[in-house]
Interface confidence: low
C-alpha cells in the first residue's frame, strides 16, 4: 500500500477579519494509526493550534467527525480571525507512539493572509487657532489594515491638496498596518465653512473610501475691521458714535470705549448679523454729551478679539463747533486699516 | 488576461425568473467591485447597481430594488444577476462591468465589461 | 440623481475630421467622469476615467477634458473604427448615471 500523504490543497487562503477560515487537509491512508495536529509556523518555535487527541481550542472547529474510524479529512474551522492570525498552517500527522506520538509527516502548508479594514480615518487640526494666509497643519490617523497597500488623499472643499506626507507603519511585515498623514493648508478668511477631508481607499473598500473631516471653523481666527463714524445729532448737544466691527470669526469679541483715554463702558458682542461667508458683524454705539466737554473728545473703540491683543480705531470729535454743524464727515483720526464693506 | 464572461441568451415568459452569470478571468473577483448595467433595445446605458465582491454586500439603484438580486459564488468568480417575477419591460441586454480599482478613487469608473447577455420576456 | 446631457445626440463626420462631443453635469461632479465608446451588438468600452486619463490600449486620438460641469471627449483625427455611439457617465455620487449617447455617423 502506499505510503500515507497529508494534502493541503490550498496553498494560500485569504479572510477577512472576523469571519472563520477553513484550512483543508486530507490524508490519503488510514495508516499508520495516530492523530492529527495543526500548527502555525514551522520549526521547533511552531504554535499548536489543534490537537486532535488532547486540549480545549475553543475557536477551532473541525469540518468533518474525527472520531469516526474511516475518516480522512482533517480540516479546520478557525472562527473570529484576527489579523493576529495570519501565517502558514500545517496540517501533521503523528503516528502512535509510546510514550509519545512520533511526528510522521506534514502538509505542505497553507498561508492564511487576513484582510481586515481601515478604521474610520481621524482628522485633527492646530491646538491653537490661526489667522488668514497662516499655514496650518492637520494629522489623519487610520489603523489596523491588512494588506499594507493603502492610498491617503487629502482634500479641502473638495479641491484635491498636494502638500502633505504620508508614512504607513511598520515599514516591515506586520499582521496589521496604521497610516499616519500630515497636510499643510493656507488659511483664507473665506475658510469659515470650509472642511479638510482625508479619505483612505484599501482593498477592503472595493471603491467606496473612508473618510475624516475637520472643520476649519474650529482652526480659523478672522480678527476684525474696525470702522468708528459719527452719525447726524441725535439732540441739541448729543451726538451718536457708532463702531462698527465687520468679518470676525469666532464671535467670542468684547468692546470698550473710551474717552479721552478713559473707559466709558464695556460690552460683549451678542446679536451679531452672519455674513455669508461665515463671520460676524456687530455694531456698538456711544451718545455723547458734548454739552459735559469743553475741549474736543477722542473717542477710542477697542476691541478684544478671542483673547488676541487689542485693535483699536479713534474719533476726534470737536466741541468748539455747534453740534447741528457737525456732519458724519468730521476728521477722524484712524489708526490701523479702515475698509469700509457696504452691507 | 482579463475577461468577464457572460450567460448566453435567455428567453423567457412574464412572471418567470432569470439568473445571469459573470464569470471573472485574469483577475481576483474578490478584489474589484462588480457592476450590472441595463441596456433596453435602442436605448442608453442604466447603472443598476453594484455588489462589493469582497463582503458580498449589494448595492442597488432605486429602480432595481425588489425584484433584482446580486449575487456571488467565488469560489467559481462569478457574479450573479437574478431578476424575478419578469415583465416585458425587463427584456434588455444585461451586462457586468468591473470598478476600475481600489488603489485610487476612481470606484465607480468601469474598465472591464462582460459581452452582455440579452434577456427577451415574452409570451 | 445627476443628470447628464450629452450633445450634440447625434452627428455626421468624415474620416480624418476632428470631432467634439461636450458632456454636461447637472451638479458638479468634479473629475469623476468617464467615456465609454460602443458599437452595434457589442459591449461598451472603456476610454477615459477621471475626465482626461486613457485607459491604456486606446489610442491618442482620444482625449478627454473639464472639470466640474463641462466635459469633453476630442477625437483628433477620426478613423474608419471610430464611428459609434459615446456615452459620458459621472461616478462622483450614486446612483451612477450615464448620458443619452451620442451617435457619430459616416457623413
Known amino acids: 500500500e502506499e505510503e500515507l500523504q497529508v494534502i493541503q490543497p490550498d496553498k494560500s487562503v485569504l479572510v477577512a477579519a472576523g469571519e472563520t477560515a477553513t484550512l483543508r487537509c486530507t490524508a490519503t491512508s488510514l495508516i499508520p494509526v495516530g492523530p492529527i495536529q495543526w500548527f502555525r509556523g514551522a520549526g521547533p518555535g511552531r504554535e499548536l493550534i489543534y490537537n486532535q487527541k488532547e486540549g480545549h481550542f475553543p475557536r477551532v472547529t473541525t469540518v468533518s467527525d474525527l472520531t469516526k474510524r474511516n475518516n480522512m479529512d482533517f480540516s479546520i474551522r478557525i472562527g473570529n480571525i484576527t489579523p493576529a492570525d495570519a501565517g502558514t498552517y500545517y496540517c501533521v500527522k503523528f503516528r502512535k507512539g509510546s510514550p509519545d506520538d512520533v511526528e510522521f509527516k506534514s502538509g505542505a502548508g497553507t498561508e492564511l493572509s487576513v484582510r481586515a479594514k481601515p478604521s474610520a480615518p481621524v482628522v485633527s487640526g492646530p491646538a491653537a487657532r490661526a489667522t488668514p494666509q497662516h499655514t496650518v497643519s492637520f494629522t489623519c490617523e487610520s489603523h489596523g489594515f491588512s494588506p499594507r497597500d493603502i492610498t491617503l488623499k487629502w482634500f479641502k472643499n473638495g479641491n484635491e491638496l498636494s502638500d502633505f506626507q504620508t508614512n504607513v507603519d511598520p515599514v516591515g511585515e506586520s499582521v496589521s498596518y496604521s497610516i499616519h498623514s500630515t497636510a499643510k493648508v493656507v488659511l483664507t478668511r473665506e475658510d469659515v465653512h470650509s472642511q479638510v477631508i482625508c479619505e483612505v481607499a484599501h482593498v477592503t473598500l472595493q471603491g467606496d473610501p473612508l473618510r475624516g473631516t475637520a472643520n476649519l471653523s474650529e482652526t480659523i481666527r478672522v480678527p476684525p475691521t474696525l470702522e468708528v463714524t459719527q452719525q447726524p445729532v441725535r439732540a441739541e448737544n448729543q451726538v451718536n458714535v457708532t463702531c462698527q466691527v465687520r468679518k470676525f470669526y469666532p464671535q467670542r469679541l468684547q468692546l470698550t470705549w473710551l474717552e479721552n483715554g478713559n473707559v466709558s463702558r464695556t460690552e460683549t458682542a451678542s446679536t451679531v448679523t452672519e455674513n455669508k461667508d461665515g463671520t460676524y458683524n456687530w455694531m456698538s454705539w456711544l451718545l455723547v454729551n458734548v454739552s459735559a466737554h469743553r475741549d474736543d473728545v477722542k473717542l477710542t473703540c477697542q476691541v478684544e478679539h478671542d483673547g488676541q491683543p487689542a485693535v483699536s480705531k479713534s474719533h476726534d470729535l470737536k466741541v468748539s463747533a455747534h453740534p447741528k454743524e457737525q456732519g458724519s464727515n468730521t476728521a477722524a483720526e484712524n489708526t490701523g486699516s479702515n475698509e469700509r464693506n457696504i452691507y | 488576461q482579463i475577461q468577464l464572461v457572460q450567460s448566453g441568451s435567455e428567453l423567457k415568459k412574464p412572471g418567470a425568473s432569470v439568473k445571469v452569470s459573470c464569470r471573472a478571468g485574469g483577475y481576483t473577483l474578490t478584489d474589484y467591485a462588480m457592476n450590472w448595467v441595463r441596456q433596453a433595445p435602442g436605448q442608453g446605458l442604466e447603472w443598476m447597481g453594484f455588489?462589493?465582491?469582497?463582503?458580498?454586500?449589494?448595492t442597488y439603484a432605486q429602480g432595481f430594488k425588489g425584484r433584482f438580486v446580486f449575487s456571488l459564488d467565488t469560489s467559481v468568480s462569478t457574479a450573479y444577476l437574478q431578476i424575478g417575477s419578469l415583465k416585458a419591460e425587463d427584456t434588455a441586454v444585461y451586462y457586468c462591468a468591473r470598478t476600475r480599482g481600489y488603489y485610487d478613487f476612481d470606484g465607480g469608473a468601469f474598465d472591464y465589461w462582460g459581452q452582455g447577455t440579452l434577456v427577451t420576456v415574452s409570451s | 440623481d445627476i443628470q447628464m446631457t450629452q450633445s450634440p445626440s447625434s452627428l455626421s463626420a468624415s474620416v480624418g475630421d476632428r470631432v467634439t462631443i461636450t458632456c454636461r453635469a447637472s451638479?458638479?461632479?468634479?473629475?469623476?467622469l468617464a467615456w465609454y465608446q460602443q458599437k452595434p451588438g457589442k459591449a461598451p468600452k472603456s476610454l477615459i476615467y477621471s475626465a482626461i486619463y486613457r485607459y491604456i490600449g486606446v489610442p491618442s486620438r482620444f482625449s478627454g477634458s473639464g472639470s466640474g460641469t463641462d466635459f469633453t471627449l476630442t477625437i483628433s483625427s477620426l478613423q474608419p473604427e471610430d464611428f459609434a455611439t459615446y456615452y459620458c457617465?459621472?461616478?462622483?455620487?450614486?446612483?451612477?448615471?450615464f448620458g443619452q449617447g451620442t451617435k457619430l455617423e459616416i457623413k
Open positions: 455588489i462589493n465582491t469582497y463582503t458580498g454586500e449589494p
Open positions: 457617465q459621472q461616478y462622483n455620487t450614486y446612483p451612477l448615471t
Open positions: 451638479q458638479n461632479v468634479g473629475t469623476h
